[in-house]
């Protein structure tokens, strides 16, 4: 049923042991009760007990107190279960009877006699609180209390709301006092049958079948299914949608496995040198002072930067250098002088000039003398100033370099290039090769020096693909495609590094 009407009999008083008809019971009134519960009637009438009825065994003789009893015969409070929405109103008839017969089943005995009866009509809300009452007539008194409570799994003001807690495929919830569902932790939805996925799990790309789970849909990965899975074999690329392979900066090819930026990815240049993505190996290192080698891996002397001043000599040490100062100078770089102009430090007629508010000095030397104190006679060729085998010649206060053929410049440091004469006409690009200069001609020109104007421009049709540069006059076909990095073929039509399934890969 959906609820139970409970009636607790507490005390019955029939001191004179009288029946309703005025006769007395012999030897005393052996009393049992009949209870009839029905729908509310303004005037109680005979007829079926629509809400239920119940009888008790003999509970006592004449006057007695009724004890609570939870089970078996003579249970108290009496239970009147019902299986409908409690209407909130009722009629109750309690009859006290005397039986000469069986104690346990007096209802069936012949010769039962009515002692007294009471009728209650009214309203009663569902609740745990007992309503206590007492009814008297001329001969008897009955004390009792009653209430209506909902059966297990029924809730609400009229016990009409069925709720049975569960934790299975059909739901995961407990029941609130009003019968509404209270989802167990990790579950949601009207019937608490939808799991709450791991916090942050992507709404579209992830799902779960139990709480705190995040199962990724195809093409997605990561704890929260918010990272796309790139194309299988994608080496140096990313995706914004599944199965993409968008190359990282400096990488190319279908699978982003072609290194277009050797500098960034391999850092071949050491010791703070600058790397540029050019040259025969795909990169060139420009060394900082003090370093040399293809990768600037070889440390020149720490003294290469000439840190010692005032004629100090430099000595390499493990991670640094040490300046051995000439007499009269001191400090880490021989930058401080012991003497001032007042000590007449300049030789050979040198004139002394004070520096740093008189704390140091500088000697201005006459011609042909040098050194911080004008102590050295000048030989302008001792430093071998002429490069590339040039001959040094002292010419009074100056010197000149006589250069070998093919070289020029004050120190013979400049190579005279075949291209220096600009042999290429019409804006052609000159390349110095061992056998002489070669011209690469712009579109519309050909010939060894780009001197021939082509009436039919082979590059005009745009025969080169993938951003390649078209040149004419270098081949019998009248054009050559200079491919950008990452493409090959006579027209630069094939990407490098295609998978073997492509027919043009050997």
């Amino acid at each position: 049923g959906s609820g139970i009407f409970q009636l607790r009999l507490q005390e019955f008083v029939n001191q004179r042991g009288m029946l309703a008809n005025g006769q007395s019971c012999e030897p005393g009134c052996r009393t049992f009760f009949r209870i009839c519960l029905k729908h509310f009637q303004a005037t109680f009438s005979e007829g079926p007990c629509t809400f239920g009825n119940v009888s008790t065994p003999v509970l006592g003789t004449n006057s007695f107190v009724v004890r609570d009893k939870n089970s078996g015969s003579g249970r108290n409070p009496l239970q009147l279960p019902f299986n409908f929405t409690w209407p909130g109103t009722f009629s109750l008839n309690i009859q006290a009877w005397h039986t000469p017969g069986d104690d346990l089943r007096p209802e069936t005995s012949p010769g039962n006699s009515l002692i007294s009866q009471i009728i209650i009509q009214g309203s009663l809300a569902v609740g745990k609180i007992w309503r206590t009452d007492e009814q008297n007539d001329t001969l008897t008194r009955l004390s009792y209390s009653y209430r209506v409570i909902c059966s297990d799994n029924y809730y609400g003001e009229s016990c009409s709301r069925l709720c049975k807690k569960r934790d299975d495929h059909f739901g995961h919830y407990e029941c609130q006092p009003d019968g509404s569902l209270s989802c167990l932790p990790g579950w949601t939805g009207k019937y608490c049958d939808q799991p709450i996925c791991l916090s942050g799990c992507h709404e579209q790309n992830g799902y779960c079948s139990k709480p705190d789970e995040c199962i990724c849909r195809p093409g997605w990965q990561g704890r929260l299914c918010n990272e796309c899975i790139p194309h299988n074999g994608c080496r140096h690329g990313t995706c914004s949608i599944p199965w993409q392979c968008a190359c990282d900066e400096g990488w190319g090819g279908l699978f982003c496995d072609q290194d277009l930026n050797y500098c960034t990815h391999h850092s071949p240049c050491k010791n703070g040198s600058t790397c540029s993505n050019s040259g025969p190996k795909g990169y060139t290192c420009t060394c900082l002072p003090g370093y040399t080698g293809e990768h600037c891996e070889l440390g020149l002397s720490k003294c290469a930067s000439n840190p010692c001043r005032n004629g100090g000599s430099c000595k390499d040490q493990e991670n640094s250098y040490h300046c051995l100062c000439p007499p009269g100078y001191y400090g880490q770089h021989c930058e401080h002088s012991t003497l001032t102009c007042a000590d007449s430090p300049c030789f050979n007629g040198g004139s002394c000039r004070e520096r740093n508010q008189g704390s140091s000095y500088a000697c201005e030397c006459p011609p042909n003398f040098t050194g911080s104190n004008c102590e050295k006679k000048v030989d302008r060729c001792t430093s071998n100033p002429c490069a590339n085998g040039g001959q040094c010649q002292n010419r009074g206060p100056s010197r000149t370099c006589r250069c070998r053929p093919g070289f020029t410049g004050t120190h013979c440091e400049l190579h005279i290039s075949d291209c220096a004469r600009s042999p290429c006409a019409h804006g052609g690009t000159c390349h110095d090769l061992e056998n002489g200069p070669v011209c690469t001609c712009p579109a519309g020109f050909s010939g060894r020096r780009c001197e021939v104007r082509i009436t039919h421009d082979a590059c005009a049709s745009g025969p080169c693909f993938n951003g390649a540069t078209c040149y004419t006059g270098l081949s019998p076909n009248n054009f050559v495609c200079n491919c950008p990095y990452g493409f090959v073929g006579s027209r630069c039509e094939f990407p490098v590094g295609l998978p073997p399934s492509f027919p043009w890969v050997a």
Epitope: P327, L339, E375
Partner: nanobody, 119 residues
Framework: EVQLVESGGGLVQAGGSLRLSCAAS????????MGWYRQAPGKQRELVAT??????TRYADSAKGRFTISRDNAKTVSLQMDNLKPEDTGVYYC??????????????WGQGTQVTVSS
């Protein structure tokens, strides 16, 4: 040839004082300056203090305010060292800056005197 002889080194407690003296002898050309260098164990020789003929004094940063250099005459120099610290420990070399016939400047050095400052 110039000879330089130092004296006054020794062991002293931190906070104590020492006075170093140096005298030049021999075939003395023009001396332009005299002074003291220190060489701590495992380190390079570094200037402590120097004074020129024109009375120009120079001090290392670590010596300023604690050490005083003075030329008693053209051939002698003294270094008064007060409030000594353990980091002042080392061999103290007297030097003189003099001219040669060439002409150029040259340093002449003494044998050195040990100064040890204990903490």
């Amino acid at each position: 040839e110039v000879q330089l002889v130092e004296s006054g080194g020794g062991l002293v407690q931190a906070g104590g004082s020492l006075r170093l003296s140096c005298a030049a002898s021999g075939d003395i050309p023009r001396i332009a300056a005299m002074g003291w260098y220190r060489q701590a164990p495992g380190k390079q020789r570094e200037l402590v203090a120097t004074v020129s003929n024109a009375a120009t004094t120079r001090y290392a940063d670590s010596a300023k305010g604690r050490f005083t250099i003075s030329r008693d005459n053209a051939k002698t120099v003294s270094l008064q060292m007060d409030n000594l610290k353990p980091e002042d420990t080392g061999v103290y070399y007297c030097y003189s800056l003099a001219t040669t016939v060439t002409p150029s400047w040259v340093n002449y050095w003494g044998q050195g005197t040990q100064v040890t400052v204990s903490s």
